[in-house]
């Protein structure tokens, strides 16, 4: 259960201060320094390829 | 119980390098980014570089961009702050720090600071 | 982060009013308080929530770029330094810090 006041992001996504909302945290494989990331607690499996 | 506890300050001459550990207990230190904030004597807080928790992602003040590599071993649980070509202006006390995403990135867990002192 | 006032004089009982306003708009905001010799301690998270065993004389509010941290009632163990912080651009970013001294 969260606290109350914390953001409010679902497993595998983050907060992003400077958008004010949560973000996947897919996206940080290709763009590792957006300031989501930075609470993007485990890096995201590498796309699975034949 | 929840803790940080820092090694690795002291006296090092300008030029020189100088590396800070910071150990986590009593957390699954892999689910939380980490922070390093640092306070010049009489100064007010700095903050340094973050990491987050795969070390993936990692991010610096310019003041110190290009010169300290932030830095962790998850299966140690422990941080790091490698810190180069130190300037008389990097004197001070450098604290880790747990991040907090979920409190929209405070910081809710410190180190008890360690010193770093700069000078010939 | 500008912190104002740089110092503020107060007797224990009265109420504290600090201010931290921010060059460009910031979505949430995060105050720190350090006692000397001391780690600094999260008091606010997210602009108004407060952390773990904080008082509920404490309490924030504001947006956009003004801020304010106020304690209702001053207690001998309130008198420190408070920092106020934010997280935009990839970085984070302190205040100057307002200490709080018994006048």
């Known amino acids: 259960e969260q606290a109350p006041g914390t953001a409010p992001c679902s497993r595998g996504s983050s907060w992003s201060a400077d958008l004010d909302k949560c973000m996947d945290c897919a996206s940080c494989r290709a763009a590792p320094h957006s300031d989501f990331c930075l609470g993007c607690a485990a890096a995201p499996p590498a796309p699975f390829r034949l | 119980q929840v803790q940080l506890v820092q090694s690795g300050g002291g006296l090092v001459k300008p030029g020189g390098s100088l590396r800070l550990s910071c150990a986590a207990s009593?957390?699954?230190?892999?689910?939380?980014?980490m922070s390093w904030v640092r306070q010049a004597p009489g100064k007010g807080l700095e903050w340094v570089s973050a990491?987050?928790?795969?070390?993936?992602?990692?991010y610096y003040a310019d003041s110190v961009k290009g010169r300290f590599t932030i830095s962790r071993d998850n299966p140690k649980n422990t941080l790091y702050l490698q810190m180069n070509s130190l300037r008389a202006e990097d004197t001070a006390v450098y604290y880790c720090?747990?991040?907090?995403?979920?409190?929209?990135?405070?910081?809710?867990?410190w180190g008890q600071g360690t010193l770093v002192t700069v000078s010939s | 982060l500008t912190q104002s006032p740089g110092t503020l004089s107060l007797s224990p009982g009265e109420r504290a009013t600090l201010s931290c306003r921010a060059s460009?708009?910031?979505?949430?905001l995060t105050w720190y308080q350090q006692k000397p010799g001391q780690a600094p301690r999260l008091l606010i998270y997210?602009?108004?929530s407060r952390a773990t065993g904080i008082p509920n004389r404490f309490s924030g509010s504001g947006s956009g770029t003004d801020f304010t941290l106020t304690i209702t009632r001053l207690e001998p163990e309130d008198f420190a330094v408070y920092y106020c912080?934010?997280?935009?651009?990839?970085?984070?970013?302190f205040g100057g810090g307002t200490k709080v001294e018994i006048t």
């Open positions: 460009q708009s910031v979505s949430r």
């Open positions: 997210g602009t108004s």
């Open positions: 990491i987050s928790g795969s070390g993936g992602s990692t």
């Open positions: 720090a747990r991040v907090r995403a979920n409190y929209y990135y405070g910081m809710d867990v």
């Open positions: 912080q934010q997280f935009r651009n990839s970085l984070l970013t």
């Open positions: 009593g957390f699954t230190f892999t689910s939380y980014a």
